[in-house]
């Protein structure tokens, strides 16, 4: 997803952020999940994307670009509403579904010009096109009923590029799916830590071979596994130390001793 300057941002007056945490630097935290998030960049005065590790970090972190702008850019909602009210349906509403090249499997919505409705589709996590909305409501406001809904213009933030589907109609496909061997997972009541520490090691969907560590809640130890570069789950750490730091604190050894530190 691109971080292009938004036309409306340049119109915003005061450069002082609305909240002190908006001035904090992006902090991905010590964990190694890969969660697309947004932060307010004090230097560019824009909300920008970063990859959050899944734990710790700071308050300058938002799930959506829209949420970031509403929270940290003074006067953003007012300006965005003014820009969108009475607008015609944007051209990108007519673009065909494009899942993009990545393998992230995200639930998204697009406007289907055949059915004249917003529909769910699976987005891979990068590239694709701007007919791509995080919520059904957002899609409807912008593409189904653009005139009657004076709401902020979609900020899925794709670069200006050329993309179109259906170059040929060939349907053959190959699935490169690695089915991981699931280690023994203890009963949930034995573990009080982060939920993903209970997940089995998952090699993911791709073809790389990266050394990673996962927390085995049955043994209370972090073990090495090969990660293929995409997919998988959040029980995935680049070092044994990070793995232990994130997951070991939640293991209940027995009733008298409590949590292992």
């Amino acid at each position: 997803l691109s971080e292009e300057a938004d036309d409306t941002d340049s119109e915003l007056g005061s450069m002082k952020p609305l909240h002190t945490f908006c001035a904090m630097k992006a902090d991905d935290g010590p964990c190694k999940a890969m969660i697309r998030s947004y932060f307010f960049n004090m230097y560019t005065h824009q909300c920008e994307e970063f990859i959050y590790g899944g734990c710790e970090g700071n308050e300058n972190r938002f799930d959506t670009l829209e949420e970031c702008k509403k929270t940290c850019i003074p006067g953003y909602e007012k300006t965005a509403v003014k820009a969108a009210s009475g607008a015609e349906r944007p051209d990108f509403c007519f673009l065909e579904e494009d899942p993009g090249l990545c393998r992230g499997y995200m639930k998204r919505y697009l406007y289907n010009n055949q059915t004249k409705q917003c529909e769910r589709f699976v987005y891979g996590g990068c590239l694709g096109n701007r007919n791509n909305f995080e919520t059904l409501d957002e899609c409807k406001k912008i593409c189904e009923n653009p005139v009657h809904s004076p709401s902020p213009v979609n900020e899925v933030q794709m670069s200006d590029y050329v993309t179109d589907g259906n170059t040929v109609t060939d349907r053959s496909t190959v699935n490169n799916i690695v089915v991981p061997q699931s280690p023994k997972v203890p009963r949930r009541r034995d573990y009080r830590g982060r939920p993903w520490c209970l997940q089995p090691a998952d090699s993911g969907l791709c073809k790389a071979s990266e050394r990673r560590f996962y927390y085995n809640s049955a043994t209370g130890k972090c073990h090495r596994f090969n990660y293929t570069g995409c997919g998988g789950n959040n029980n995935n750490f680049t070092t044994r130390r990070r793995c232990l730091r994130s997951c070991k604190t939640g293991l209940i050894k027995n009733k008298s001793k409590g949590v292992v530190k």
């Epitope: 691109s2 890969m34 560019t44 090249l101 990068c126």
Partner: antibody, heavy 124, light 107 residues
Framework: QVQLQQSGPGLVKPSQTLSLTCAIS??????????WGWIRQSPGRGLEWLGL?????????AYAVSVKSRITINPDTSKNQFSLQLNSVTPEDTAVYYC??????????????WGQGTLVTVSS | DIQMTQSPSSLSASVGDRVTITCRAS??????LHWYQQKPGKAPKLLIY???TLQSGVPSRFSGSGSGTDFTLTISSLQPEDFATYYC?????????FGQGTKVEIK
């Protein structure tokens, strides 16, 4: 081990069509874990991305705006290869052309395997 | 298009030196930045993807860092086989664009 083998003429006349083929071994052109593309390199312009194709239950493509009106990248599933066609070439299109595999991860797309390169000269 | 600017354009170094190459994007690109190495007459070779993840089989003396607009490729101890040209490339949006390259030469 994935390998890409390029083939095609090294000399093309101005206004004609440049055609190159990239044969894939060790992977499938219709694999759903990435895509296939073309990049060229010339002393004047450096490395220039031209476009790519990928398969996700149907075929998709993306082309650089600079060549959009002249370029076609097509898969050939029967031969497990893909091709580049660049129409109406001029001497400006003289470059070393590379095919590449684009591997898609959760958030990243990168060229992890490249063809050997083909020097294409456009001259009468 | 997103412009990628590398510095320096070339540098001279000795075996064992620590070498740092920087790449700046004309706009924020999160961590969608990859590094390639190219030797004369050869195709580029992927070193690092996602700004900091080492590609399988690449020696650990190579490392990458940065996010947003400023990125760095570091070779901790230069080896004879590392004399080459290095390119950064953004994948934030189409068209993918490359830096102009940094040539690492023997001092």
């Amino acid at each position: 081990q994935v390998q890409l083998q390029q083939s095609g003429p090294g000399l093309v006349k101005p206004s004609q069509t440049l055609s190159l083929t990239c044969a894939i071994s060790g992977d499938s052109v219709s694999s759903n874990s990435g895509g296939w593309g073309w990049i060229r390199q010339s002393p004047g312009r450096g490395l220039e991305w031209l476009g790519l194709i990928y398969y996700r239950s149907k075929w998709y493509n993306a082309y650089a705006v600079s060549v959009k009106s002249r370029i076609t990248i097509n898969p050939d599933t029967s031969k497990n290869q893909f091709s580049l066609q660049l129409n109406s070439v001029t001497p400006e299109d003289t470059a070393v052309y590379y095919c590449a595999r684009y591997l898609g991860s959760n958030f990243y797309v990168y060229s992890d395997v490249w063809g050997q390169g083909t020097l294409v000269t456009v001259s009468s | 298009d997103i412009q990628m600017t590398q510095s320096p354009s070339s540098l001279s170094a000795s075996v064992g030196d620590r070498v740092t190459i920087t790449c700046r994007a004309s706009q924020g690109i999160s961590s969608y930045l990859h590094w390639y190495q190219q030797k004369p007459g050869k195709a580029p070779k992927l070193l690092i993807y996602g700004a900091s993840t080492l590609q399988s089989g690449v020696p650990s003396r190579f490392s990458g860092s940065g996010s947003g607009t400023d990125f760095t490729l570091t070779i901790s101890s230069l080896q004879p086989e590392d004399f080459a040209t290095y390119y950064c490339q953004q994948q934030n949006g189409y068209p993918f664009t490359f830096g102009q390259g940094t040539k690492v030469e023997i001092k």
